[in-house]
C-alpha cells in the first residue's frame, strides 16, 4: 500500500553495476529496424532530457542492405515514471506522472496488407 | 535545480490519452527477434511489478520461420527510475533508483564473430 | 549478484568424453543465453559454445563443431556442455557465462566469472 504523499530522496541510487548501460548505444543502427534518437526536453520534468526513438524507415533492412517492405520497421515503447513539478515551477513538490516513450525499434511481420 | 529531498504526490496523471499502451503487445511474438516477457516482483520498488523482455534466440527468424544465425537477437534496453522504499518497509519515505530494463528486441548485423 | 559454479572437469585420454555443468543463481530477469568459454595456459579466453535459454538454439565455435552438444535446464537453471572426441588442444579451464547480449556480447564485456573447471587430455 502506498500513501498519496510521500518524501523522495532525490540523490539517485544506480543499481546498473553489473551491466553497462550504455551498451546498446550502436543498436540503433546496426538493427534491421534502424531508428534515431530524438532529445525530449522538458524542465517542468524529472528527468528534463528523454531521448525518444523514431524509426527510420516503414520496411525493414534486408541482407543487401536495401528497405524491404514486406516487413515493418515498429517502435518498442515501455510507460515510465517521471517527476512532474506540481503546481508548476514548484521547486520541491512534484507529482508522479506515467508517460509513453519509445525505446527502439523491431522488425515485425505485417499483419495488414493494404500496400501495393 | 532539484533539492535533495522533495514531496511527491503519488497520484498518477496518465499522460498517455492519445496513444494504447497496449498497440505494442503482440510485437513480442511478431517481431524476427522474438521475445518472452518476464515479471519482475519487488514491493520495495514503486512501481513493484516491471516486466522485462527476455529474446528468445541468439539468431533473428528469417522468412521461412527459421533461426538465422548470421544475424543476431539482441535486447533494447532502457534506465528507468523507480522509488525505492528507504529505509526498508518505509511506509512514506522513499529514494530514486535507476535501473536499467529490457524492453523487448531487435535484430542486429554481428559485429562479434565467434560462431562456426 | 551472479554467481557461476562450472564441475565436471577431470582427465581424459584422447577420443575420451567429458560433461561438464554449470549451475547459475542471482541471474538478471532478462538474462536469454548462456555460453562456455575455455582458457588454455599462455592463452586468451575464447568462446566455445552458447545457448538461449527460451528457444534452446545452440551456436558453437568452429574448433568444437560437432564434437561438442551445449544443453540447459531452465528449472534447475543449470548449462550443461557435452564433450565427445576430446582432442589435446581442449585442454584448458572451462568457464560458463551468461551472456547479457547474446552472441553480440563482447569478451570485455565479462564483469564476473566463476572458478571453472580444468579439463586435461592426454594422449
Known amino acids: 500500500n502506498f500513501p498519496r504523499t510521500v518524501m523522495v530522496n532525490l540523490n539517485i541510487h544506480n543499481r546498473n553495476t553489473n551491466t553497462n548501460p550504455k551498451r546498446s548505444s550502436d543498436y540503433y543502427d546496426r538493427s534491421t529496424s534502424p531508428w534515431n534518437l530524438h532529445r525530449n526536453e522538458d524542465p517542468e520534468r524529472y528527468p528534463s532530457v528523454i531521448w525518444e526513438a523514431k524509426c527510420r524507415h516503414l520496411g525493414c533492412i534486408n541482407a543487401d542492405g536495401n528497405v524491404d517492405y514486406h516487413m515493418n520497421s515498429v517502435p518498442i515503447q515501455q510507460e515510465i515514471l517521471v517527476l512532474r513539478r506540481e503546481p508548476p515551477h514548484s521547486p520541491n513538490s512534484f507529482r508522479l506522472e506515467k508517460i509513453l516513450v519509445s525505446v527502439g525499434c523491431t522488425c515485425v511481420t505485417p499483419i495488414v496488407h493494404h500496400v501495393a | 535545480n532539484f533539492p535533495r529531498t522533495v514531496m511527491v504526490n503519488l497520484n498518477i496523471h496518465n499522460r498517455n490519452t492519445n496513444t494504447n499502451p497496449k498497440r505494442s503487445s503482440d510485437y513480442y511474438d511478431r517481431s524476427t527477434s522474438p521475445w518472452n516477457l518476464h515479471r519482475n516482483e519487488d514491493p520495495e520498488r514503486y512501481p513493484s511489478v516491471i516486466w522485462e523482455a527476455k529474446c528468445r534466440h541468439l539468431g533473428c527468424i528469417n522468412a521461412d520461420g527459421n533461426v538465422d544465425y548470421h544475424m543476431n537477437s539482441v535486447p533494447i534496453q532502457q534506465e528507468i527510475l523507480v522509488l525505492r522504499r528507504e529505509p526498508p518497509h518505509s511506509p512514506n519515505s522513499f529514494r530514486l533508483e535507476k535501473i536499467l530494463v529490457s524492453v523487448g528486441c531487435t535484430c542486429v548485423t554481428p559485429i562479434v564473430h565467434h560462431v562456426a | 549478484q551472479v554467481q557461476l559454479v562450472e564441475s565436471g572437469g577431470g582427465l581424459v585420454q584422447v577420443g575420451g568424453s567429458l560433461r561438464l555443468s554449470c549451475e547459475v543463481s542471482g541471474l538478471p530477469v532478462s538474462s536469454y543465453a548462456m555460453g562456455w568459454f575455455r582458457q588454455a595456459p599462455e592463452k586468451e579466453r575464447e568462446f566455445v559454445a552458447a545457448?538461449?535459454?527460451?528457444?534452446?538454439?545452440?551456436r558453437y565455435a568452429h574448433f568444437v563443431k560437432g564434437r561438442f552438444t551445449i544443453s540447459r535446464d531452465n528449472a534447475k537453471n543449470t548449462v550443461h556442455l557435452q564433450m565427445d572426441s576430446l582432442k589435446p588442444e581442449d585442454t584448458a579451464v572451462y568457464y560458463c557465462?551468461?551472456?547479457?547480449?547474446?552472441?553480440?556480447?563482447?569478451?570485455?564485456?565479462?564483469?564476473?566469472w566463476g572458478l571453472g573447471t580444468q579439463v586435461t587430455v592426454s594422449s
Open positions: 557465462n551468461d551472456m547479457p547480449y547474446g552472441l553480440d556480447t563482447r569478451m570485455d564485456e565479462y564483469e564476473y
Open positions: 545457448i538461449s535459454w527460451i528457444g534452446g538454439d545452440s
